[in-house]
């Protein structure tokens, strides 16, 4: 018979011979030849692979460093890498998340649009006409200004988008 | 048939550089690693290192790292180990042998002399 | 590095006799073991691989056995192209390493 051009799924083509790759977990010690099969062993502790595959050296796990706040949020298997994410107040600086960076606070005048998570920053967003944020802040959203009216009071003084109105009693006219 | 034919034996001084040939044939060169053992006389076997023609890729015993150099030349299927810094301790015969992890097929073996 | 640790270093035995030679790895292997023969001034030649696979071509009188730490190749009877020099190897991880050989002489 013709030797192979192309092998199956799973098998790849050495020396005019279709082999049998590595399962995931497993590495290659020795190629298939004529007359022998392929032979592949576990990685070992802290080492994956996670396709099959014809590797002579499993990769190590991921280590999450404590020192870049880093830590882990998966732990790895002889089929998956390890998964890091950072700690509480923290956000990575890339999607590989191999650092982290404290939450930004918004600044008064703009409010929190959505609160940081483990994989990314804080959203902030300038506070509309009729709202105020008076603090920096990586939670508070804006404030709306508070309703003079409904305590049956006056506007005093203008809200900004930092600061809320100032309410007061109304002048009442004496007939 | 797998064949593997190795360079002749050498004689070199202490201090100097040795370059062993093994030339292949019988099989596609690319898909086959080529390691080197090495036998001192009336001694045991040691692993010097593979190299994967189809690659480039090398792995080398730590032993022998900074001195060894593994290369191939794929238009003659030919695999080339160099040790550098000789001393008379690396008196052996060096064999190639392919395939990865067992050695189904071996070089006659090179003997390599150190000697001032 | 694992260090494998063959005996006896040297045996005599007559022909037919069964003769067993043991190798001992420093730490687990699995089945990656291979033995070769040796004759004076001779390459190895490959005869079990993966701890009991017999290689192509080689006499069924040859067999191997073993996993983890402990491993054993027997010549069940003998032959006169039998004496020679046995050796164990590991290629579960790097380096490879050998046992030191076992030379089976005449008696």
């Known amino acids: 018979p013709e030797p192979p051009t192309a092998c199956r799924e799973k098998q790849y083509l050495i020396n005019s011979q279709c082999c049998s790759l590595c399962q995931p977990g497993q590495k290659l010690v020795s190629d298939c030849t004529e007359f022998t099969e392929t032979e592949c062993l576990p990685c070992g502790e802290s080492e994956f692979l996670d396709t099959w595959n014809r590797e002579t050296h499993c990769h190590q796990h991921k280590y999450c460093d404590p020192n870049l706040g880093l830590r882990v949020q998966q732990k790895g298997t002889s089929e998956t890498d390890t998964i890091c994410t950072c700690e509480e107040g923290w956000h990575c600086t890339s999607e590989a998340c191999e650092s982290c960076v404290l939450h930004r606070s918004c600044s008064p005048g703009f409010g929190v649009k959505q609160i940081a998570t483990g994989v990314s920053d804080t959203i902030c967003e300038p506070c509309p006409v009729g709202f105020f944020s008076n603090v920096s802040s990586a939670f508070e959203k804006c404030h709306p200004w508070t309703s003079c009216e409904t305590k049956d009071l006056v506007v005093q003084q203008a809200g900004t988008n930092k600061t809320d109105v100032v309410c007061g009693p109304q002048d009442r006219l004496r007939a | 048939e797998v064949q593997l034919v190795q360079s002749g034996a050498e004689v070199k001084k202490p201090g100097s550089s040795v370059k062993v040939s093994c030339k292949a044939s019988?099989?596609?060169?690319?898909?086959?690693?080529i390691n080197w053992v090495r036998q001192a006389p009336g001694q045991g076997l040691e692993w010097i290192g593979w190299i994967f023609p189809g690659s480039g890729s090398v792995y080398c015993n730590e032993q022998f790292k900074g001195r060894v150099t593994i290369t191939v030349d794929k238009s003659t299927s030919t695999a080339y180990m160099e040790l550098s810094s000789l001393r008379s301790e690396d008196t052996a015969v060096y064999y190639c042998?392919?395939?990865?992890?067992?050695?189904?097929?071996w070089g006659q073996g090179t003997l390599v002399t150190v000697s001032s | 590095d694992i260090q494998m640790t063959q005996s006896p270093s040297s045996l005599s035995a007559s022909v037919g006799d069964r003769v067993t030679i043991t190798c001992k790895a420093s730490?687990?292997?699995?089945?990656?073991v291979a033995w070769y023969q040796q004759k004076p001034g001779k390459s190895p030649k490959l005869l079990i691989y993966?701890?009991?696979n017999r290689y192509t071509g080689v006499p069924s009188r040859f067999s191997g056995s073993g996993s983890g730490t402990d491993f054993t190749l027997t010549i069940s009877s003998l032959q006169p192209e039998d004496f020679a020099t046995y050796f164990c190897q590991q290629y579960s991880s790097y380096p490879y390493t050998f046992g030191g050989g076992t030379k089976v002489e005449i008696k």
């Open positions: 993966s701890a009991s």
């Open positions: 042998a392919s395939s990865l992890g067992k050695f189904a097929y």
């Open positions: 730490q687990s292997v699995v089945t990656a």
């Open positions: 019988g099989y596609t060169f690319t898909d086959y690693y």
